[in-house]
Interface confidence: low
């Protein structure tokens, strides 16, 4: 799953590691626009 931040939120893309605080990282788990987020994020939640 690639990073999904809105155009308003492009510069937090360096916060990469998913948290253990959520069960899964679904597409609805982050805001929608992927075009301004260069860093892909892991889909794994331990």
């Amino acid at each position: 799953v690639s990073s999904a931040l809105t155009p308003h939120l492009p510069t937090h893309a360096d916060s990469q590691t998913p948290s253990t605080g959520t069960d899964t990282q679904t597409p609805s788990g982050s805001a929608a626009n992927t075009t301004l987020s260069p860093t892909p994020r892991s889909n794994d939640i331990s």
């Epitope: 510069t11 948290s19 605080g21 609805s28």
Partner: antibody
Amino acid sequence: AVQLLESGGGLIQPGGSLRLSCAASGFTFSSYAMSWVRQAPGKGLEWVSAISGSGGSTFYADSVRGRFTISRDNSKNTLYLQMNSLRVEDTAVYYCAKEVMGPIFFDYWGQGTLVTVSS
Amino acid sequence: EIVLTQSPGTLSLSPGERATLSCRASQSIISSALAWYQQKPGQAPRLLIYGASSRATGIPDRFSGSGSGTDFTLTISRLEPEDFAVYHCQQYGSTPLTFGGGTKVEIK
């Protein structure tokens, strides 16, 4: 276990300055964006500011922009909020919160530190 | 700025009853970017739901979230004594991140 411990709150006069700190442990601090969220007595939550994992990018609510500065020291696993030109309406409990993968929602919160701005 | 309005302000119910809390946004929230938190007196908020309907780790399945666009709902299917608290919704579709005013669920 993830722990976030805020400090630095207290009583301050209007126009004064205060620096809040949040000591983080139990996770790779530099990998996560962090935020400050505040709650005035008896009121709802208000997002104040956010900072990216590297510290290179910051966001602010309009109500504090130009007066507050968020920063972090990843070598010390500590988040800061420098508050200048404090106003009575800044009185609140200030929470440090760990973000999930970006400036989105918060999976861990500290217990908060009370800032009271009064003459 | 997206304004979130929660209703009712206070919900008076008995243990075992169903609680339905509403969060309405002033404009559509992209990708259902909405979270719900529980807060008890003197404590920090606790994440319950993200992405409008996904439960956070350790959250009992009596808590469920639904909705999209501008209307979102948190449902507690059967209230337990520990569920009486204030519930906040938060949108993260755009900055500034905003919260609703909260709904207090109190014992009737």
